[in-house]
Interface confidence: medium
């Protein structure tokens, strides 16, 4: 018979012959022959192959380096790679999450518009008139100035985007 020019799914062509691919989690040891099946071996510890393959070496699981703010979100298996995520207070620097950076804090005069997540940084906004923030924080929003009137007091010192108003007693001597 004519040697095949194409093979079925989960097979590969070698030496004019269709051999079975190794299943996920296994690597190729030797190609099939007329008389023998493809020989495959399971990947070792900390290794994986996630497709039907003819690879002679398994891939190393990704290392979630704590020095880069990473931790394991999901442990790898012989068929899947390790998935990393960021420690609390950190977020990924890329979609692949190869390293993390600390969440940014909003400086005094700025408040948090959106709290950071594992994949996005803190979004800050300037405190508008009538609001202030006197701390550097990754969580605090701008706070409204104290309303002196509701406390039967008067404004002694005007507020800024970084400081609250200072209230004081009404001047009783004034007519």
């Amino acid at each position: 018979p004519e040697p095949p020019t194409a093979c079925r799914e989960k097979q590969y062509l070698i030496n004019s012959q269709c051999c079975s691919l190794c299943q996920p989690g296994q690597k190729l040891v030797s190609d099939c022959t007329e008389f023998t099946e493809t020989e495959c071996l399971p990947c070792g510890e900390s290794e994986f192959l996630d497709t039907w393959n003819r690879e002679t070496h398994c891939h190393q699981h990704k290392y979630c380096d704590p020095n880069l703010g990473l931790r394991v979100q999901q442990k790898g298996t012989s068929e899947t790679d390790t998935i990393c995520t960021c420690e609390e207070g950190w977020h990924c620097t890329s979609e692949a999450c190869e390293s993390c950076v600390l969440h940014r804090s909003c400086s005094p005069g700025f408040g948090v518009k959106q709290i950071a997540t594992g994949v996005s940084d803190t979004i800050c906004e300037p405190c508008p008139v009538g609001f202030f923030s006197n701390v550097s924080s990754a969580f605090e929003k701008c706070h409204p100035w104290t309303s002196c009137e509701t406390k039967d007091l008067v404004v002694q010192q005007a507020g800024t985007n970084k400081t609250d108003v200072v209230c004081g007693p009404q001047d009783r001597l004034r007519a």
């Epitope: 290392y63 704590p66 020095n67 703010g69 931790r71 394991v72 999901q74 420690e87 950190w90």
Partner: antibody, heavy 121, light 106 residues
């Protein structure tokens, strides 16, 4: 030979302060995260704090947060633990430990001999 | 906060197999490590990444971790294995140790 040697322990009154040091040798200190672990008399191991290799990230147990500060000087191959507002329950042997990195995943593969901290009036 | 639970004590006859368990919520999703500590000595790492043995640790020490339980197994237990054993895992920016298990070789 990979070695960690702690120092700085001693007797201190409640409310007092103490600074522990851990001198590292035999490995590239700046490549590894480092931790402090303590053990109260007759009790089990309790994690205290961990610092990343470059010092950018620090992690603390709730029991010491706000009172203890971990730091490191990679030029001196030394790890520190500044302990303030000490309490009787901080009495323990304090161990310095090296995080295993990619060779000993999420484990502490080298430990010091420990230094004893006693908080008592 | 995350907790790891170990039996306070386990007894075994010489030559027999000792199993020490460590349980925690979805512990199988984390990497577990085990330490041996003899009286007056510092802890020694005996198992890391659930089941791997550091160089110099005898083959009789093995580990597994799935579901909610990690297990340290010592086959052909020897008198020199008598010690306290602690499991450990990283859990969301904190390191957690189990309470420890005293292994007595009868």
């Amino acid at each position: 030979e990979v070695q960690l040697v702690e120092s700085g322990g001693g007797l201190v009154q409640p409310g007092g302060s103490l600074r522990l040091s851990c001198a590292a040798s035999g490995f590239t200190f700046s490549s590894y995260a480092m931790s402090w672990v303590r053990q109260a008399p007759g009790k089990g191991l309790e994690w205290v704090s961990t610092i990343q290799n470059a010092g950018g990230g620090t992690y603390y147990a709730d029991s010491v947060k706000g009172r203890f500060t971990i730091s490191r000087d990679n030029s001196k191959n030394t790890l520190y633990l500044q302990m303030n507002s000490l309490r009787a329950e901080d009495t323990a042997v304090y161990y310095c430990a090296k995080e295993g990195g990619k060779y000993y995943y999420y484990a502490m593969d080298v430990w010091g001999q420990g230094t004893t901290v006693t908080v008592s009036s | 906060s995350y907790e790891l639970t170990q039996p306070p004590s386990v007894s075994v006859s010489p030559g027999q197999t000792a199993s020490i368990t460590c349980s925690g919520d979805k512990l199988g999703d984390k990497y577990a490590a085990w330490y041996q500590q003899k009286p007056g000595q510092s802890p020694v790492l005996v198992i890391y990444q659930d089941s791997r043995r550091p160089s110099g640790i005898p083959e009789r020490f093995s580990g597994s971790n799935s579901g909610n339980t990690a297990t340290l197994t010592i086959s052909g237990t020897q008198a020199m294995d008598e010690a306290d054993y602690y499991c450990q895992a990283w859990a969301s920016s904190t390191v957690v140790f189990g309470g420890g298990t005293k292994l007595t070789v009868l």
